[in-house]
């Protein structure tokens, strides 16, 4: 039972996580305009990830797609592919934890494949949390870089007369989005790759089992092969109950580790 | 054409205050800030502050706070201005106008006269 | 504040004349989010309201002649009329949308010979 909640908390956890992610990459809202000055402003700047928002005291606001691909500065393409690696991951580490849930029921489906998927599905979450949260951290060093930087040239430019007021940009709700988000599926993945730990069954291990069969009996190890019993090499262990051979099936496969991007 | 009907004009005392209005019908009226101007005779315009016309916030330029004081009333789309404390400085012509891209003011209301006399 | 100063304070011309008027702000207009500069031009007619001709320095309002033109940035402007008609006889006010508070010329007086 608290395997199964652990398991659903960590689905849904992650959900709103991953939710958060898109959120966060499809967000205006990266940086904006630094107020700190002017606390009332006519013309409020804000950018995102794909565009540049201009907010007019009016109410008027025009957004601008970054058309160009080669133009923008490779750090701003790095978060962008942060921040779609994570959803890419997230969105089929849902998929895979679907069918994981212990609740939900499908064919003939194992427990051990149960296992095997919800640590799958913990992992991925894992990487894609922290492919946001970096993503975010980013573009965060970026603009404290930057920030910096403006005020370094405001109060070296201002011999003139006339004034050029530089705009300075801080960060924007989005980024408190992605490492919230971010977080969350962080947070979604450990607990289901817990949830896993009580999903596999435990591996018994028999040194020899007793064989009952009318009229002889034959004792074997598991994995032997016995040509005049009619078996194939069997790998699997047998549990053996009383008054007849039952078999139950008990594997126990553990994934090969893979370096997701 | 959006027209903006300001009230007639006032003839006020020196201390008094003084409510003048700027309705505008025929078109949404929550869609724009709603703007003041102050033209006096002969001079040059000065804004004296804007009031959101949905949310109610305002801002003012600063020569103008506790002289001006702005409303809205969006169930017959009108706008206020109350002037307190009135001098001979503030006889003028105020215009309300409406505010749109570029934080431009495309449509002016006919002005308010206000004349401060004794 | 931004102070605009606006030259000459008041011109003569024929009409039929082409006619430049200049609007300077003390600090720059020009948006560097947009890349557009919040100036506005504003004709009243003696007796009248106000009229908006020209946002964001260079765009024309809808129903305007297209013998007024604006152009400048950053904190130089000017308005441009390339034949005056005797109705262009106004007082012309550029405006700083900027930044609060919203501040006007002292406005260019166009008198028609």
């Known amino acids: 039972m608290a395997v199964t909640a652990c398991q659903g908390l960590g689905f849904v956890v992650s959900l709103i996580g991953i939710a958060g992610i898109i959120a966060a990459t499809c967000m205006d809202q990266w940086s904006t305009q630094d107020l700190y000055n002017n606390p009332v402003t006519a013309v409020f700047n804000y950018q995102g990830l794909w565009r540049s928002c201009v907010r007019e005291s009016s109410g008027f606001t025009e957004c601008r797609g970054y058309f160009t691909l080669l133009g923008l500065p490779a750090m701003l393409q790095a978060v962008r592919a942060l921040m779609i690696v994570g959803i890419v991951l997230g969105a089929i580490g849902l998929l895979v934890s679907i069918f994981a849930l212990k609740c939900i029921r499908i064919g003939s489906m194992e427990d051990s494949a149960k296992a095997n998927m919800t640590l799958t599905s913990g992992i991925m979450f894992i990487v894609s949390g922290l492919c946001a949260i970096a993503g975010v951290s980013v573009f965060a060093n970026m603009l404290v870089t930057n920030f910096w930087m403006s005020t370094a040239n405001m109060y070296t430019g201002m011999g003139g007369m006339v004034q050029t007021v530089q705009t300075r940009y801080t960060f924007g709700a989005a980024l408190f989005v992605g490492w919230v988000a971010g977080g969350l599926t962080l947070i979604g993945g450990v607990m289901m790759c817990i949830a896993c730990r009580g999903l596999a069954p435990e591996e018994t291990n028999y040194k020899a089992v007793s064989y009952h069969a009318s009229g002889h009996s034959v004792a074997y190890k598991p994995g032997g092969f016995k040509a005049s019993t009619g078996f194939g090499s069997n790998t699997k262990n047998k549990k053996i109950y009383d008054g007849g051979a039952r078999t139950e099936d008990e594997v126990q496969s553990y994934p090969s580790k893979h370096d997701y991007v | 054409e959006i027209q903006l009907q300001q009230s007639g004009a006032e003839l006020v005392k020196p201390g008094a205050s003084v409510k003048i209005s700027c309705k505008a019908p025929?078109?949404?009226?929550?869609?724009?800030?709603m703007n003041w101007v102050k033209q006096s005779h002969g001079k040059s315009l000065e804004w004296i502050g804007n009031i959101n016309s949905y949310y109610g916030s305002t801002s003012y330029n600063q020569k103008f706070k506790g002289k001006a004081t702005l409303t809205v009333d969006r169930s017959s789309s009108t706008a206020y201005m109350q002037l307190n404390s009135l001098t001979s400085e503030d006889s003028a012509v105020y215009y309300c106008t409406n505010f749109d891209r570029g934080n431009s003011f495309p449509y002016w209301g006919h002005g308010t006269l206000v004349t401060v006399s004794a | 504040d931004i102070v605009m100063t606006q030259s000459p304070s008041s011109l003569t011309v024929t009409v039929g004349e082409k006619v430049t008027m200049t609007c300077k702000s003390s600090?720059?207009?020009?948006?560097?989010?947009?890349?557009?500069?919040?100036l506005t031009w504003y004709q009243q007619k003696p007796g009248q309201s106000p009229k908006l001709l020209i946002y964001?320095?260079?765009t024309r309002e809808s129903g305007v002649p297209e013998r007024f033109t604006g152009r400048g940035s950053g904190t130089d402007f000017t308005l441009t009329i390339s034949s005056v008609q005797a109705e262009d006889l106004a007082v012309y006010y550029c405006?700083?949308?900027?930044?609060?508070?919203?501040?006007f010329g002292s406005g260019t007086n166009l008198e028609i010979k």
């Open positions: 964001w320095a260079s």
């Open positions: 600090q720059s207009l020009l948006n560097s989010g947009n890349q557009k500069n919040y």
């Open positions: 025929g078109y949404s009226f929550t869609d724009y800030n």
């Open positions: 405006q700083n949308g900027y930044s609060y508070p919203f501040t």
